[in-house]
Structures are given as structure tokens and as C-alpha cells.
Amino acid sequence: AQNITARIGEPLVLKCKGAPKKPPQRLEWKLNTGRTEAWKVLSPQGGGPWDSVARVLPNGSLFLPAVGIQDEGIFRCQAMNRNGKETKSNYRVRVYQIPGKPEIVDSASELTAGVPNKVGTCVSEGSYPAGTLSWHLDGKPLVPNEKGVSVKEQTRRHPETGLFTLQSELMVTPARGGDPRPTFSCSFSPGLPRHRALRTAPIQPRVWEPVPLEEVQLVVEPEGGAVAPGGTVTLTCEVPAQPSPQIHWMKDGVPLPLPPSPVLILPEIGPQDQGTYSCVATHSSHGPQESRAVSISIIEPGEEGPTAGSVGGSGLGTLALA
């Protein structure tokens, strides 16, 4: 039998070899598919409910206007030409549907080294036959049950359309000291050959290394954080870790838009500088660490206040990070 693959919903024409190009013709189509109990015989005369599913064209070919899952099976044609020579055609029809692009849902933004983590769930909807999902790390296939990799798979079939939804949940245990930003992707491989795999957009979770951390110290000058108007406050974030982490600053719990720096200098202090300051150290190998908060206050405030008074010489300096 000749193998034929047809996309679900598309038309299909099967040629009846040896049949005269136009009537009168002596030919017969026999079908054994999901729509038939055993063999169903179709003749050029046609008619009846089968015409909407499959009908014989004037040239003897069999025409299926929209192939469905139930049309998978064997199609045979037996034709006799004008000289009485008999020719048989035999087709094995399989149908397919390519799903939408797979997606990774519930993806983790951060993984912890040394312990199992759920990376995400890969979902492919609307395939036929089911096909398979596979995971990749930095472009290379991940093998389940190897090196801390485990995959939980689930296949569901739509009760009406018969199309498949595949789900694959990936769990990994990142090695300590490994790649801090691994790239994971997932691909759908169709069940029928000659169709290329569909790949998700990659995800790049951070890997956090749980290391016993030494505390981040915040030193304030002048000590106590109380300063006269126009004075200068210097905040220094001391982190014992090597290499030096990136230091960012917070005021009243809100990040300050400043370039990273271990020192924050507040010259020409004014009332709007009052508040609670802390620093956040971000290491490449583990998560952010916040210091204690220190309060900056103004002692003996002068007349300076909103629009009733001015700051600094010709303009208060903007905050600098040293």
C-alpha cells in the first residue's frame, strides 16, 4: 500500500490508477476507515450521505473535501480500462494536525542549587497524532532520570475534536557552582515523520547558591544619621563577600534610581533627604541581601521648606553614589 499523509481539515484526492479519464468507467472504491464497520464500497454513481465525506470524481479519483481523524485507514480502487485490463490502487491514509507553538507556563524565575526545583510546564495543544515533548538545556537534550532531571508527562485528548494536549513538567537539581543563568527550552516533535519540531521561546532562570552569608553592614557618617541642614551624610555598605557584589540603595523601602555603588553620599542635606536608608547587595551566586536600615534626620531645621526657601548654591546637588 502507498502511504499517504493528509492534514486534518484539508481536501484529499486519491487517484484510481488505470481508470478511464471519463465515464463510462468500470471502477469501485473500497474503504476501511474509522467511519466504516468493515469495507464500504463507493461507486461513481454515488449519492446518499457519504457524498459529504467522500465521493468519486468524474475522472475516477476519490475526493475527500475535509479529512478528519476518522478517515484514517485503507482505501482501495479496482478499475478496468476499455481493453478489460484490471488495475488496483491501494492507499494507507494517515492524518495529522500540527499544534500551535508550544509554551512554557508556570516558569520559575529562580532555581536553588543543590535541591530539586520545578523549572516549568511545557504545554502543546491541538496535535494529532499525540507527538512528544522534550526538554533542552542550553540547546542540548535533557535526558529524564539522569543528573537530577525528572519529567512528569500528561496526555489528554479533546472529547470532540480528538486532538491531543500534551503537558510536560520539568524538575531539575542545578549543580552547585554551575551556570548561574541556564537556558531551558522545550520542543514538540510530531508523531508523523517529515515534520520539523516546534520549539518554545527559551527561559533563563537565575540559579541561587544558598551560601551561609556574612551580614551586610551599613555604616553611616555622622554616626546616628543626624545632620544639620546643608551638611553631608555618607552611607557605606560593607560586604565581606568576594567578588564584590553590586550594591543598590533604598530609601523608605523604595529603590533609588542610582548607578550601583558601595557608597552613597548625600551632600547639602535638606528636608526631603530625611528617611530610612538601606543598601542591597546582589551577588552573582546567590540572591539579594539587604542591610539594616538607618534613619537620616535633620537637626535644628532652619527656614528651608517647600518652595519657601532654597537649597544649595544655585541648585541642590543631586544625590551621588561614590
Partner: antibody, heavy 116, light 107 residues
Framework: QVQLQQSGAELVRPGTSLKVSCKAS????????IEWVNQRPGQGLEWIGV????????HYNEKFKGKATLTADKSSSTAYMQLSSLTSDDSAIYFC???????????WGQGTSVTV | DIVMTQSQKFMSTSVGDRVSVTCKAS??????VAWYQQKPGQSPKSLIY???YRYSGVPDRFTGSGSGTDFTLTISNVQSEDLAEYFC?????????FGAGTKLELK
């Protein structure tokens, strides 16, 4: 008094690079940030990025990443902005300005006109 | 990105008038807003920071107000030297953004 003195006007060919300087005086250079802003002919102001001269830390407007590189030399109290792969779209006046945390820009340079 | 909208591109005024230039932020920026004055061929001059604080040397006829998303620069008793373009700017979060400017002209 606080002053930010920028380098002079430049007329350059497309595809070339250019370094604009901003010399600070009258204050402690490392106590403040230096911001860079541009203004295309007849247009408004656009923030390019900021450098902390004390630490060398920088932050850029995404639009200018790869176009502008900010550096600072503490010994000469000078901030620099290098502009690369110049095109006619980069023709503008470039300003440096002093700023600090919790505050905006207070003093501005006189501007450097760049024509590509 | 936070968009700063100055809805009036031009405003007409007379010497001695009181005029208010407005600026609207697309999201809450607290009081992290500054106002700048720019005259043709000159660099911007800093007037107001933290929405309502005047820089030293700025005449007290310039007043800033507002918080959250709505900000106003008011010039009472407009002088001829105040005829210029005024820009608002947010410095609440990166990247910093400016309004498109409002030109103050004589009636």
C-alpha cells in the same frame, strides 16, 4: 562656584566616534553624579545616562546602550561621554549636568553641539 | 517607561500675569519631579526639585506643587525674562524622562 565646562562643538563624519568631555569645578567631584542629556534640533530633552564618578557605576537609557559610553577621571574631575558609530540621527546638543540621589540635576554644562 | 505629558505646547501671557504650567506623569512618581527653564541657545536652568523645592538663586515668584501624577509650575508676576520654554522631568525611576516642553510667549 560650581561649574561644568564642556568641550567645544564638533563636526564629524558618519560612522566615526567622538568623545565629549565635561570638566567639573567648584565642588567635590566624587560626591555627586554626572548625568548626560541630549537635545535634537528643535526638540525636547532626552536622558542618556548617568555615572557615579566615585565608583564608576553607570546606568543607561536602553536606547543609548551601545551608542554612548560614560566614564569619569577622578584625578582631573572630568566626565566623558563616548559616542560611537555616529549617524545623522545623533546630531544634537549634548549636555552634562550634576545631580545626586533624591534630587534632580542642579547645574548644567553649556552643551556641546555635535553635527554628523 | 514613565511618560511625562505637558499638554500645552505654548502658553500666552503678559508681564505681571500669573501663569501655571502643568505636567502629568503616566504613573505615580511621588514628588520626584523637577522643573527646568530653557532659553533659545542656552542650556537648561534648574528651577525646582522634589516637586516644590526651589534651588537657591531662583526668584520666589516660581512655585512648584503637586505629587503622585499631577504637577504644576506657577509663575506669579511674570517678568519678560521668564519668557522661555519650561520642561518637567521625573527622576523617580530609571530611565529618567522629560515632558515635551511648554513655551511661554507674550500675548
Amino acid at each position: 562656584q560650581v561649574q561644568l565646562q564642556q568641550s567645544g562643538a564638533e563636526l564629524v563624519r558618519p560612522g566615526t566616534s567622538l568623545k565629549v568631555s565635561c570638566k567639573a569645578s567648584g565642588y567635590a567631584f566624587t560626591n555627586y553624579l554626572i548625568e548626560w542629556v541630549n537635545q535634537r534640533p528643535g526638540q525636547g530633552l532626552e536622558w542618556i545616562g548617568v555615572i557615579n564618578p566615585g565608583s564608576g557605576g553607570t546606568h543607561y537609557n536602553e536606547k543609548f546602550k551601545g551608542k554612548a559610553t560614560l566614564t569619569a577621571d577622578k584625578s582631573s574631575s572630568t566626565a566623558y561621554m563616548q559616542l560611537s558609530s555616529l549617524t545623522s540621527d545623533d546630531s544634537a546638543i549634548y549636555f552634562c549636568a550634576r545631580s545626586r540621589a533624591v534630587r534632580a540635576m542642579d547645574y548644567w554644562g553649556q552643551g556641546t553641539s555635535v553635527t554628523v | 517607561d514613565i511618560v511625562m505629558t505637558q499638554s500645552q505646547k505654548f502658553m500666552s501671557t503678559s508681564v505681571g500675569d500669573r501663569v501655571s504650567v502643568t505636567c502629568k506623569a503616566s504613573q505615580n512618581v511621588g514628588t520626584n519631579v523637577a522643573w527646568y527653564q530653557q532659553k533659545p541657545g542656552q542650556s537648561p536652568k534648574s528651577l525646582i526639585y522634589s516637586a516644590s523645592y526651589r534651588y537657591s538663586g531662583v526668584p520666589d515668584r516660581f512655585t512648584g506643587s503637586g505629587s503622585g501624577t499631577d504637577f504644576t509650575l506657577t509663575i506669579s508676576n511674570v517678568q519678560s525674562e521668564d519668557l522661555a520654554e519650561y520642561f518637567c522631568q521625573q527622576y523617580n525611576s530609571y530611565f529618567f524622562t522629560f515632558g515635551a516642553g511648554t513655551k511661554l510667549e507674550l500675548k
